[in-house]
């Protein structure tokens, strides 16, 4: 049990969120971090993976309503599969209909997250800021 | 000890955040919630108080760097004191210099928070969305 060093008691009226990597945002037991150094999609993915996380996956407007208010454009973990025309997440799951409005503004196979659940298609090799996410169990 | 019902063990590599009201955002042990119903400043203040919180107080660009990415305009707990011309928070503390760029766009004694640590002066009776904050001990 050497990995554990704290025991905390949680009041019924409030709750703890996490666990998350230190100084990440915790919301509805998901962990998020916004990285403001610009990287291409592949580098962004690698950065998230190195922190035991993945690029942002949008799976619920309710559970992830904090994303409505996010300013600017950030890489998320959505990629286009040319062989079948679908958009899928890093974990292989297909983008659910009506979860994101996909904006066809650039020619590319990756997508940037923008406020109010929009996804902007972008060339995967263009540097952008990115959002990492870690789902707690 | 009847208020407490959970015992959790926290790994050294990760940490829990909070405690916060259920479904609030937790970041660097502060709790935040964005409310999208529009209220005037006084109603917004009352709403936060009813949830054992206060309107947003900006006290640190480092500890509150998540606020950089907030889209739109939201009431925060900053009010103008006409007698001495200062801006102060609900708790009576004075706004620290260089923490917010105050933008004099409207005539008023209250302030809206906008991304990248900007404060927009606004008439306190105008309805706006608002941010509540609860500092954990």
């Amino acid at each position: 049990n050497s990995l554990f060093n704290q025991e905390v008691q949680i009041p019924l009226t409030e709750s703890y969120c996490g666990p998350c990597p230190k100084n990440w945002i915790c919301y509805k037991n998901n962990c998020y971090q916004f990285f403001n150094e610009s990287k291409n999609w592949y580098e962004s993915q690698a950065s998230c993976m190195s922190q035991n996380a993945s690029l942002l996956k949008v799976y619920s407007k309710e559970d992830q309503d904090l994303l409505k208010l996010v300013k600017s454009y950030h890489w998320m973990g959505l990629v286009h599969i040319p062989t079948n025309g679908s958009w899928q997440w890093e974990d292989g799951s297909i983008l659910s209909p009506n979860l994101l409005t996909i904006i066809e503004m650039q020619k590319g196979d990756c997508a940037l997250y923008a406020s109010s659940f929009k996804g902007y298609i972008e060339n995967c090799s263009i540097p952008n800021t990115y959002i990492c996410m870690q789902r707690t169990v | 000890n009847s208020l407490f019902n959970q015992e959790v063990q926290i790994p050294l590599t990760e940490s829990y955040c909070g405690p916060c009201p259920k479904n609030w955002i937790c970041y660097k042990n502060n709790c935040y919630q964005f409310f999208n119903e529009s209220k005037n400043w006084y109603e917004s203040q009352a709403s936060c108080m009813s949830q054992n919180a206060s309107l947003l107080k900006v006290y640190s660009k480092e500890d509150q760097d998540l606020l950089k990415l907030v889209k739109s305009y939201h009431w925060m707990g900053l009010v103008h004191i006409p007698t001495n011309g200062s801006w102060q928070w609900e708790d009576g503390s004075i706004l620290s210099p260089n923490l917010l760029t105050i933008i004099e766009m409207q005539k008023g004694d209250c302030a809206l928070y906008a991304s990248s640590f900007k404060g927009y002066i606004e008439n306190c009776s105008i309805p706006n969305t608002y941010i509540c904050m609860q500092r954990t001990v």
Partner: antibody, heavy 121, light 107 residues
Framework: QQLEQSGGGLVKPGGSLELCCIA?????????MTWVRQAPGKGLEWIGC?????????SYASWVNGRFTLSRDIDQSTGCLQLTSLTAADTAMYYC??????????????WGQGTMVTVSS | DIQMTQSPSSLSASVGDRVTITCQAN??????LNWYQQKPGKAPKLLIY???SLQSGVPSRFSGSGSGTDFTLTISSLQPEDFAAYYC?????????FGGGTKVEIK
Amino acid sequence: QQLEQSGGGLVKPGGSLELCCIASGFDFSTYWMTWVRQAPGKGLEWIGCIHGGGSGTTSYASWVNGRFTLSRDIDQSTGCLQLTSLTAADTAMYYCARPGYRSWSKTFDLWGQGTMVTVSS
Amino acid sequence: DIQMTQSPSSLSASVGDRVTITCQANQDISNALNWYQQKPGKAPKLLIYAASSLQSGVPSRFSGSGSGTDFTLTISSLQPEDFAAYYCQQAASFPLTFGGGTKVEIK
């Protein structure tokens, strides 16, 4: 890059017709193909789309109601639109179109020349 | 389905005029809006995509603006070859829908 349309013509009410669109100059299997129609003197109306790849995923306008069917032949780089149970209201110019990039499905920069379908007894 | 309302349905203008066509969606479509030009007997031609991006090869006198529900196509100085029909199309979600069209005629 080109879309060449074939088919069309005069058909009796209740009849059927197949319109096809041959793609050249690009990898058909990685693009969506869309069909749009335009009744004489009227506006544009989206019919549906099909992906040229292995899955052949389709999407249709709600008014189509199963009367029209999209298909594709990857080897021939061809997309087809089968029209059935035709009525006079289906009289229109039918266009095939391709999006501006393979990951796009809703913005069309390449169009066929159009083929006229006339439904009349 | 998202409904697109275009106005006016027709307009008369002279060469050199500034022409504005509007398109309204019945729900927020962000900037997922395209504009097409169509000349008689021809297929439509993409002018503007993503509300304000000019398609390659389209003259700069064409511009698009707007976001959410209200959009505008502007021709800054009408040329003889611009007399045609113009259509907006929402590209936010299936089923795709077009506006009713605006016919630009010579005054």
